[in-house]
């Protein structure tokens, strides 16, 4: 397991909500990404491929999420001070081998200016 701070902007604020960006290498084909708040799993997304190369995307703990070819974004809405915490992107790489787990994260600071607009986007 590799642990570290995200070396990119992990939190993007929008109208009282936050987009948490979890990046992974372009070469990764199949993986599980979990968003952890402290030690608790908030959200997850798993991408696998079958023998016909068909993609399957699953979420056991569903959050609004968005998948690109090198990141998963998880969206949290209606921010309040209780959201302030360490958040971690827990990436399990299935393919290509070898199996590997990486953990990157950062602290989400909540400021009054980010709580002004309770709009969903």
């Amino acid at each position: 397991e590799i642990n570290g701070s995200a070396n990119y902007e992990m939190f993007i604020f929008h109208n009282g909500g936050v987009q948490i960006l979890c990046k992974y290498p372009d070469i990764v084909q199949q993986f599980k990404m979990q968003l952890l708040k402290g030690g608790q799993i908030l959200c997850d997304l798993t991408k696998t491929k079958g023998s016909g190369n068909t993609v399957s995307i699953k979420s056991l703990k569903f959050c609004h999420s968005q998948l690109s070819n090198n990141s998963v974004s998880f969206f949290l809405y209606n921010l309040d001070h209780s959201h302030a915490n360490y958040y971690f992107c827990n990436l399990s790489i299935f393919d290509p081998p070898p199996f590997k787990v990486t953990l990157t994260g950062g602290y989400l600071h909540i400021y009054e200016s980010q709580l002004c607009c309770q709009l969903k986007f």
Partner: antibody, heavy 116, light 111 residues
């Protein structure tokens, strides 16, 4: 240790048969699963696959519309419902685990004989 | 559907000698950095066993006398020093798209 154990049988042309495959030694619900068949003395032919929770299924053109793949993750079991069977469906049917980039575990196979 | 062909149909090689099997696909199996091509070994009376994936990566526990090479449409499985336990039929297989298909197989025997 991964184990896949199939069951099959003898059936008449036009008849139906359900194959089952009992899986153990791994988290069944984490893997796509497939059926591959092999006619006596012939090569390997892919039949069908199913994703981790059964929401995606794919079929070979030879069996589409006649065969249905399904799974019961609570019972760790894969199924193949075969209808309108023909003599040319006679083969050893293998249950296989798609291990992300290859069929990494195979059952011993079950012989399905379609004969009158 | 992608058609897989193999050559030769069969070959007999002396113990300790090199065996080479060729596989050709009717369209390229290369996507990004990966060739979606696997090799399987099937010994008499047994189910197949995964040997090589992504054209050149040996599966866990596969002896290093087995190697895979090639890209695009042309692939090769090489057994550098044939052992008695290598007598089997070898199949190439693609998972580039659906339906995945196997080659017809190459039978390897001892000369």
């Amino acid at each position: 240790e991964v184990q896949l154990v199939e069951s099959g049988g003898l059936v008449q042309p036009g008849g139906s048969l359900r194959l089952s495959c009992a899986a153990s030694g791994f988290t069944f619900s984490d893997y796509w699963m497939d059926w591959v068949r092999q006619a006596p003395g012939k090569g390997l032919v892919w039949v069908s696959n199913i994703d981790e929770d059964g929401s995606i299924t794919e079929y070979s053109p030879f069996v589409k519309g006649r065969f249905t793949i399904s799974r019961d993750n609570a019972k760790n079991t894969l199924y193949l419902q075969m209808n309108s069977l023909r003599a040319e469906d006679t083969a050893v049917y293998y249950c296989t685990r798609w291990g992300r980039f290859g069929f990494d575990s195979w059952g011993q196979g079950t012989l399905v004989t379609v004969s009158s | 559907d992608i058609v897989m062909t193999q050559s030769p149909d069969s070959l007999a090689v002396s113990l300790g000698e090199r065996a080479t099997i060729n596989c050709k696909s009717s369209q390229s199996l290369l996507s990004g950095s990966f060739n979606y091509l696997t090799w399987y070994q099937q010994k008499p009376g047994q189910p197949p066993k995964l040997l090589i994936f992504y054209a050149s990566t040996r599966h866990t526990g596969v002896p290093d006398r087995f190697s895979g090479s090639g890209s695009g449409t042309d692939f090769t499985l090489t057994i550098s020093s044939l052992q008695a336990e290598d007598v089997a039929v070898y199949y190439c297989h693609h998972h580039y798209n659906a339906p995945p298909t196997f080659g017809p197989g190459t039978k390897v025997d001892i000369k």
